[in-house]
């Protein structure tokens, strides 16, 4: 069985979260993808999404979030720059496939942002590095709103639980790793 894991990233304010979600490229290459935050007991909230159809390695920036979909590699790259303490939370990538439910991707990201910048391992980039040259053609994509009760997500259980998804058996496991990424000075 494939394990739906949750990775914990501990970063400082001003740093950048730089993660990826993989998908089956044959099925979902041009599908619209989204980055969502999951708050306890609430519906996942879409923060940014790619265009529809998704364009290959074409950056889409929505505020401090940059999405890049590498069709030919089956990877969605998500960057959240200039992190703030209030960005802390549980995030996930999904693929929109109307009229079906959004398809959740691996892995969920538990982001913990703390105050103050330090030189200890913790992120990909510091605030002085957060200048991303995004092509002027970049647009904000319109993200569909899904209200299906099946996408309401509770906080991850303390014990292992089964979660059903469209094409595979998935086990939700406890967080087992804290990822600290070297700071860029």
């Amino acid at each position: 069985a494939t394990k739906l894991t949750e990775e914990k990233y501990e970063l400082k304010e001003g740093q950048t979260l730089d993660v990826k979600c993989d998908y089956t490229l044959e099925k979902f290459a041009s599908s619209q993808k989204a980055w969502q935050i999951i708050r306890d007991g609430e519906m996942p909230k879409t923060l940014a999404c790619t265009e529809r159809p998704s364009k290959n390695s074409h950056p889409v920036q929505v505020g401090r979030i940059i999405l890049e979909d590498y069709h030919d590699h089956g990877l969605l790259r998500v960057r959240m720059v200039n992190l703030q303490v209030e960005d802390s939370g549980l995030y996930q990538c999904v693929i929109y496939q109307p009229p079906k439910e959004p398809h959740m991707l691996f892995d969920r990201i538990r982001l913990v942002v703390t105050k103050g910048f330090s030189g200890t391992p913790g992120s990909n980039e510091n605030s002085t590095q957060n200048v991303y040259k995004i092509p002027p053609t970049t647009t904000k994509a319109l993200c569909p709103l899904y209200t299906s009760p099946r996408t309401v997500t509770q906080a991850p259980p303390k014990s292992t639980a089964d979660v059903s998804t469209p094409d595979s058996e998935i086990n939700l496991t406890n967080v087992t790793d804290i990822i600290r990424v070297p700071v860029f000075n």
Partner: antibody, heavy 122, light 107 residues
């Protein structure tokens, strides 16, 4: 200990396929990407693609698309790379290499197999 | 694709020398750059990641610096075991590409 152990050298005819295996031990196989890098004799390093051993998803560079298949068997912690329609220019040492966490945009390769020499000759 | 150009392609040096290798990216890669050492018949070994971070267990005589398009790899005092080929590798986007390598030989 933490290591990647690859299958032995192969000699293949043009047009044939080769399947190289890479057995991981000493770490949680499903938490890190497996990448494949090849090196032709006397040449530099060429990244072929990646695989997430947890989801089974993979991707390869355009040059190899349609010829390379990356799979895994999580029960025995083995990753496979199959290259088909072999030609003489595919003669190279093929390495598997551990990447960063499956969720991280950290494409550094901190653990390598010893390499598998694939010779394509008629 | 991003092209990585290393220079020089080869150099001769003596034990104790300070050696510098440069790597230039065809576009801005911020600090998404790694350095590897490869000895004949062996697999590459990660030395430096994210432009300047020393991999665990790698001697402190190895160092890296730079950001954007220009990067430098330095060995402060060459040891006999350092004679090898060195490669830079970017991961600013996909596909990942390596520099062509710098062969470090004994003078």
């Amino acid at each position: 200990q933490v290591q990647l152990v690859q299958s032995g050298a192969e000699v293949k005819k043009p047009g044939a396929s080769v399947k190289v295996s890479c057995k991981a031990s000493g770490y949680t196989f499903t938490r890190y990407d497996i990448n494949w890098v090849r090196q032709a004799p006397g040449q530099g390093l060429e990244w072929m693609g990646w695989m997430n051993p947890n989801s089974g998803n993979s991707g390869s560079v355009q040059k190899f698309r349609g010829r390379v298949t990356m799979t895994r068997d999580t029960s025995i912690h083995i990753a496979y790379m199959e290259l088909s329609s072999l030609r003489s220019e595919d003669t190279a040492v093929y390495y598997c290499a551990r990447g960063g966490y499956t969720s991280s945009w950290r494409w550094y390769f901190d653990l390598w197999g010893r390499g598998t020499l694939v010779t394509v000759s008629s | 694709d991003i092209q990585m150009t290393q220079s020089p392609s080869s150099l001769s040096a003596s034990v104790g020398d300070r050696v510098t290798i440069t790597c230039q990216a065809s576009q801005d890669i911020r600090k998404h750059l790694n350095w590897y050492q490869q000895k004949p018949g062996k697999a590459p070994k990660l030395l430096i990641y994210d432009a300047a971070n020393l991999e665990t267990g790698v001697p402190s005589r190895f160092s890296g610096s730079g950001s954007g398009t220009d990067f430098t790899f330095t060995i402060s005092s060459l040891q006999p075991e350092d004679f090898a080929t060195y490669y830079c590798q970017h991961y600013a986007n996909l596909p990942i590409t390596f520099g062509q390598g710098t062969r470090l030989e004994i003078k």
